[in-house]
């Protein structure tokens, strides 16, 4: 009986540790996509509707803030699209990029952790264009550090929650 109690206690401990593992999945807020044809920061994301969820991390001022030191897997998926019903592209040669950036408040500094994208030729003869970027990586993050997303040509962002999103989850503690 004692072994059983010990076992279930261990399970509970494991489960509560898992439940405390920080994670976030943030989806684009389509009502507030900034304008610009160069690199801009995307600051408006959902954290609590549809597929979006957050636990033991903080979302504030457009940035995902780390609350616990650890090794995290970071990911971002950005879709760009254009359909002729919305008008014409002013230029057919495009640089479609995403940058995942880490900012430290304690030692004021900013680093690009990941970038992805391509130059594209989106011909005016086509009715529809689409391009998707996915980046992901494993990073040591400290409490208080902030993760943000920058993109080029935000007016071409696909506003669906399954198209434009980013997130993080803690994989293990720092030894």
């Amino acid at each position: 009986e004692k072994a059983m109690v010990d076992g279930s206690w261990l399970d509970l401990a494991k489960r509560s540790k898992l439940e405390a593992q920080p994670f976030a999945h943030l989806t684009i807020n389509a009502t507030d996509i900034p304008s610009g044809s160069h690199k801009v920061s995307l600051s408006s994301w959902y954290h609590d509707r549809g597929w979006a969820k957050i636990s033991n991390m903080t979302f504030s001022n457009g940035k995902l803030i780390v609350n616990q030191d650890g090794f995290y897997y970071l990911y971002a998926n950005i879709c760009f699209r254009h359909h002729e019903t919305s008008g014409d592209l002013a230029t057919e040669y495009l640089q479609l990029m995403v940058y995942v950036t880490k900012t430290s408040i304690k030692i004021p500094s900013s680093h690009t952790l990941m970038k992805g994208g391509s130059t594209k030729y989106w011909s005016g003869n086509s009715e529809f264009h689409f391009y998707s970027i996915n980046v992901g990586g494993f990073f040591k993050l400290r409490s208080g550090e902030e993760i943000s997303i920058e993109v080029s040509n935000p007016s071409l962002l696909d506003p669906d929650q399954d198209a434009t999103y980013f997130g993080a989850f803690k994989v293990r503690d720092i030894d």
Epitope: S37, G87, T91
Partner: antibody, heavy 126, light 103 residues
Framework: QVQLVQSGAEVRKPGASVKVSCKAS????????IHWVRQAPGQRLEWMGW????????KFSQKFQGRITVTRDTAASTAYMELRSLRSEDTAVYYC???????????????????WGQGTLVTVSS | EIVMTQSPSSLSASVGDRVTITCRAS??????LNWYQLKPGKAPRLLIY???SLQSGVPSRFSGSGSGAEFTLTISSLQPEDIATYYC?????FGQGTKVEIK
């Protein structure tokens, strides 16, 4: 305030060419596209083409392809539309119009014509 | 190529009347639809963009509605200065126009 001022009326013989100008003021000319639209007597408005005043990129209606040239002079904040091989059916009022999409804020020419020139009557007659 | 069809082609109404003009697209165009007012010898004027947004400086008696393929321009209380021809437009395509006259 934003203004587009077009050149005066023109009379041409069939087969000739005409060049209409559109001088912009009251905004940064290079940040917007200029469209050309015409209206023949008793007909609906007809889109002809646009020019991105910043980079000079152009797009034309299939109907006018090969006969139309649209250029701009950024120093003079002026767009020009030249139509060649004129025929009697080209008799119309020709308008320039500004697209309301600011190219600094995005790269989509949205076809919202927020300011128009006063129109230039081109008469093609033998 | 998308075709825009307006109805009626002309209408006659009294000052103060509510006037409605309809515009149909040959396929769905979301909300990418604009309305213009044309008076003889004057520059055309953008009234409504994006199906329902009122262009600045345009009187509030003008309103637009609709999405997909069917759209409406409404003048809530017709004024003498509203005598003109009205056109709907989606990108490169214009409707054939609706001429509004006073009875």
């Amino acid at each position: 305030q934003v203004q587009l001022v077009q050149s005066g009326a023109e009379v041409r013989k069939p087969g000739a060419s005409v060049k209409v100008s559109c001088k912009a003021s009251g905004y940064d000319f290079s940040n917007y596209a200029i469209h050309w639209v015409r209206q023949a007597p008793g007909q609906r408005l007809e889109w002809m083409g646009w020019i991105n005043a910043g980079n000079g990129n152009t797009k034309f209606s299939q109907k006018f392809q090969g006969r139309i040239t649209v250029t701009r002079d950024t120093a003079a904040s002026t767009a020009y539309m030249e139509l060649r091989s004129l025929r009697s059916e080209d008799t119309a009022v020709y308008y320039c119009a500004r697209d309301n999409s600011n190219m600094v804020r995005g790269i989509i020419i949205a076809y919202y014509f927020d300011y128009w020139g006063q129109g230039t009557l081109v008469t093609v007659s033998s | 190529e998308i075709v825009m069809t307006q109805s009626p082609s002309s209408l006659s109404a009294s000052v103060g009347d509510r006037v409605t003009i309809t515009c149909r697209a040959s396929q769905s165009i979301s909300r990418y639809l604009n309305w213009y007012q044309l008076k003889p010898g004057k520059a055309p004027r953008l009234l409504i963009y994006g199906a329902s947004s009122l262009q600045s400086g345009v009187p509030s008696r003008f309103s637009g509605s609709g999405s997909g393929a069917e759209f409406t321009l409404t003048i809530s209380s017709l004024q003498p200065e509203d005598i003109a021809t009205y056109y709907c437009q989606h990108t490169r395509a214009f409707g054939q126009g609706t001429k509004v006259e006073i009875k």
